[in-house]
């Protein structure tokens, strides 16, 4: 399964789309900036089996997909870019699912890294809570967009390390 190569390209396309989605100057949103506590340590470990690593990446993409699939998101972002972004994420999710099955065998259940997946879930809960507290304001969404761009960039480094390990 050559997921890291294909996923890296998909990640790059997703990053480009995220960059294009910006609709408000971040310089007007400095008062709203926030530290969401990206779970860096979950993307630092070399202890992962490939299937486990993919399951953590899958969770991050899934949570991002969920976040940008809400009606509040639809009301914020330019529709055609949002659709392209969602399609890109969906393709990545499908690729990952196929890859995990290939890695562990159809009959086996992949050993999920429960703690890492929980850390990613909590990270996105913090993002959702922030948006709620800020009443889904344009600046709040801009801050979240910047955060997701950074988390994608950091996961890209993780994927590249995964590829080197192979």
């Amino acid at each position: 399964c050559d997921l890291p190569q294909t996923h890296s390209l998909g990640n790059r396309r997703a990053l480009i789309l995220l960059a294009q989605m910006g609709r408000i100057s971040p310089f007007s949103c400095l008062k709203d900036r926030h530290d969401f506590g990206f779970p860096q340590e979950e993307f630092d470990g070399n202890q992962f089996q490939k299937a486990q690593a993919i399951s953590v990446l899958h969770e991050m993409i899934q949570q991002t997909f969920n976040l940008f699939s809400t009606k509040d998101s639809s009301a914020t972002w330019e529709q055609s870019l949002l659709e392209k972004f969602s399609t890109e994420l969906n393709q990545q999710l499908n690729d990952m699912e196929a890859c995990v099955i290939q890695e562990v065998g159809v009959e086996e259940t992949p050993l999920m890294n429960v703690d890492s997946i929980l850390a990613v879930k909590k990270y996105f809960q913090r993002i959702t809570l922030y948006l709620t507290e800020k009443k889904y304001s344009p600046c709040a969404w801009e801050v979240v967009r910047a955060e997701i761009m950074r988390s994608f960039s950091l996961s890209k480094i993780f994927q590249e390390r995964l590829r080197r390990k192979e």
């Epitope: 910006g22 971040p26 530290d35 801050v143 910047a146 988390s151």
Partner: antibody
């Protein structure tokens, strides 16, 4: 290895124009915000302008607003500073700098700097 | 604009001993998100500035742990635990809390 190679500095008369360039390599240029910072003859650092990674948004302090324009060409991995209506107080060493990826906390730390290019405004 | 104030020179220090450089801002740099947007840069003679510290107390990549920084939100101190000859240069504090971003005038580290 991250590199920012600068060019375009020169001696120019008051009221004149100049365009500075900063060629980036060793990183995904289109993913990073960039700034220009100048160092005056008395060695003070003076932040001049900033541009977002995609180039859609810019900001300038009042001292250069309306006279300086920051831009970028992500296809060419190059940052620019167009300076017009130059004054003697614009005389400085101009540095381009890359901003660290800040995410939602918008950390605009300048983690890499070019070697600088000298601009002298004098009649 | 936020004004960053620094002394022009540090107290002269002996190699191997500790040094402190101070900086004061005209407004608290502590954001409601808990981050203090204070930065330290070092410019060695004949070189471009380099990032030392970000968000008041975090060491930038490749910076030796002899460097540390602390502060209250308005008053900040950069400490060098064992000064080496290569630490000579001008130290600038800067703020990224508000636009326009501003720098201190720089403090030159003096060696005895």
């Amino acid at each position: 290895e991250v590199q920012l190679q600068q060019s375009g500095g020169d001696l120019v008369k008051p009221g004149g124009s100049l365009k500075l360039s900063c060629a980036a390599s060793g990183f995904t240029f289109s993913s990073y915000g960039m700034s220009w910072v100048r160092q005056t003859p008395d060695k003070r650092l003076d932040w001049v302008s900033i541009i977002t990674s995609g180039g859609s948004y810019t900001y300038y302090p009042d001292s250069v607003k309306g006279r300086f324009t920051i831009s970028r060409d992500n296809a060419k991995n190059t940052l620019y500073l167009q300076m017009s209506s130059l004054k003697s107080e614009d005389t400085a060493m101009y540095y381009c700098a890359r901003h660290a990826e800040g995410g939602g906390n918008y950390d605009y730390a300048m983690d890499y700097w070019g070697q600088g290019t000298s601009v002298t405004v004098s009649s | 604009d936020i004004v960053m104030t620094q002394a022009a020179f540090s107290n002269p220090v002996t190699l191997g001993t500790s040094a402190s450089i101070s900086c004061r801002s005209s407004k608290s740099l502590l954001h409601s998100n808990g981050i203090t947007y204070l930065y330290w840069y070092l410019q060695k003679p004949g070189q471009s500035p380099q990032l030392l510290i970000y968000q008041m107390s975090n060491l930038a990549s490749g910076v030796p742990d002899r460097f540390s920084s602390s502060g209250s939100g308005i008053d900040f101190t950069l400490r060098i635990s064992r000064v080496e000859a290569e630490d000579v240069g001008a130290y600038y504090c800067a703020q990224n809390l508000e636009l326009p971003f501003t720098f201190g005038s720089g403090t030159k580290l003096e060696i005895k």
